[in-house]
Interface confidence: low
């Protein structure tokens, strides 16, 4: 369960991969596409609104939280659209939705070494947002293997 329906804090940040590729969003045929690309120097990075929530239930791995609670986030690159996990298709999609947001829009936030973060699906513990073939996908991570796997690491910059 998520403590309260209001976020405890919000921030606007651009999202990039561990290898400094930008996550960008483009409206095509009335739906949003998500791209992972090298940005030209003069192009502005897309911003995402991150809303932070406290969760009483830890995920399958103890990540960094606040006072022992897990931090959950939702990510919204534009008004009324949120990133959502599609566990059937192993994909990450942008959907228009109203509040209260579905569970698929919530991700457990894990801090990694040197300020990288990863996003674990609330609906599918052990599955993370990752980069696959230049797009975002859901990637299953074996905790006994490499949690620091580059393809699930992201950097947030203001």
């Amino acid at each position: 369960s998520i403590t309260g329906i209001s976020p405890i804090t919000e921030s606007l940040a651009s999202l990039s991969t561990y290898n400094d590729q930008s996550i960008t969003f483009a409206l095509e045929d009335e739906s949003y596409e998500i791209y992972v690309e090298d940005l030209k120097k003069d192009k502005k990075k897309d911003k995402v609104l991150l809303s932070y929530y406290e969760s009483q239930h830890p995920s399958s791995e103890s990540g960094d939280g606040v006072d022992g609670k897990m931090l959950m986030v939702t990510l919204s690159p534009t008004k009324d659209f949120w990133l959502q996990a599609n566990n059937k298709e192993h994909s990450v999609e942008l959907h228009k939705c109203e509040k209260p947001l579905p569970d698929q829009a919530f991700f457990v936030l894990h801090n990694r070494s040197f300020n990288c973060v990863s996003f674990e699906c609330k609906t599918d513990p052990g599955v993370f947002i990752g980069v696959k073939d230049n797009h975002l996908a859901l990637i299953k991570v074996d905790y006994s293997e490499n949690l620091g796997s580059e393809n699930i690491l992201f950097k947030l910059s203001e």
Epitope: Y18, N19, D20, S62, G63, D64, G65, V66, D67, G68, H110, N111, R112, S113, F114, N115, G148, E150, K155, L156, S157, E158
Partner: antibody, heavy 119, light 110 residues
Framework: EVQLLESGGGLVQPGGSLRLSCAAS????????MHWVRQAPGKGLEWVSS????????YYADSVKGRFTISRDNSKNTLYLQMNSLRAEDTAVYYC????????????WGQGTLVTVSS | QSVLTQPPSASGTPGQRVTISCSGS????????VNWYQQLPGTAPKLLIY???MRRLGVPDRFSGSKSGTSASLAISGLRSEDEADYYC???????????FGGGTKLTVL
């Protein structure tokens, strides 16, 4: 004012132990990765250890692995470094440093505390 | 022996431009941001440049950073006497799971 203040340094014999503390103020300590960095007299900076905001992720330099233990008490806004089996080569000024969430770099440093290992 | 390699010393006259290099490998500089720190005599280090080329707030624009491949550099233009200090580069190393520093460069303003 954002501040880090180290304490606990001093003279210790080889094989001895010491616990360093770093008191944080002026910021939400529990939100930040914290690190220890040391500097031997007249030498360069050497990273020692880091700990994530809720102690889930801990890293050590090979030179101190198995001898030093980093920990933190978020309720006391304090970072610790327990140093055991000290050697002469551990003699250094020990700095605690905050890893800035915006900078991905050590944006705040303490003034340092000197640890001397000598018989 | 430091993982990142810097020249031990550099010098210049007031008003000049000096560059300090920092070379590493694919597991550190090649894959991660480089940070630069300034340490004035008898004081704790201070962050100058983060994310390879971003100046920290309050740092004069005479200081600039760049990165190419597995090397990085710090350039100081319009050198001033107060720039006399030790300069260190640092980066995260993926294989060591550690922060690695350069050995430091002592900058002398002649």
């Amino acid at each position: 004012e954002v501040q880090l203040l180290e304490s606990g340094g001093g003279l210790v014999q080889p094989g001895g132990s010491l616990r360093l503390s770093c008191a944080a103020s002026g910021f939400t300590f529990s939100n930040y990765y914290m690190h220890w960095v040391r500097q031997a007299p007249g030498k360069g900076l050497e990273w020692v250890s880091s700990i994530s905001s809720s102690s889930s992720y801990i890293y050590y330099a090979d030179s101190v692995k198995g001898r030093f233990t980093i920990s933190r008490d978020n309720s006391k806004n304090t970072l610790y470094l327990q140093m055991n089996s000290l050697r002469a080569e551990d003699t250094a000024v020990y700095y605690c440093a905050r890893l800035g969430t915006r900078h991905d770099a050590f944006d705040i440093w303490g003034q340092g505390t000197l640890v001397t290992v000598s018989s | 022996q430091s993982v990142l390699t810097q020249p031990p010393s550099a010098s210049g006259t007031p008003g000049q431009r000096v560059t300090i290099s920092c070379s590493g490998s694919s597991s550190n500089i090649g894959n991660n941001a480089v940070n630069w720190y300034q340490q004035l005599p008898g004081t704790a280090p201070k962050l100058l440049i983060y994310a390879s080329n971003m100046r920290r707030l309050g740092v004069p624009d005479r200081f600039s950073g760049s990165k190419s491949g597995t090397s990085a550099s710090l350039a100081i233009s319009g050198l001033r006497s107060e720039d006399e200090a030790d300069y260190y580069c640092a980066a995260w190393d993926d294989s060591q799971k550690a922060v690695v520093f350069g050995g430091g460069t002592k900058l002398t303003v002649l």
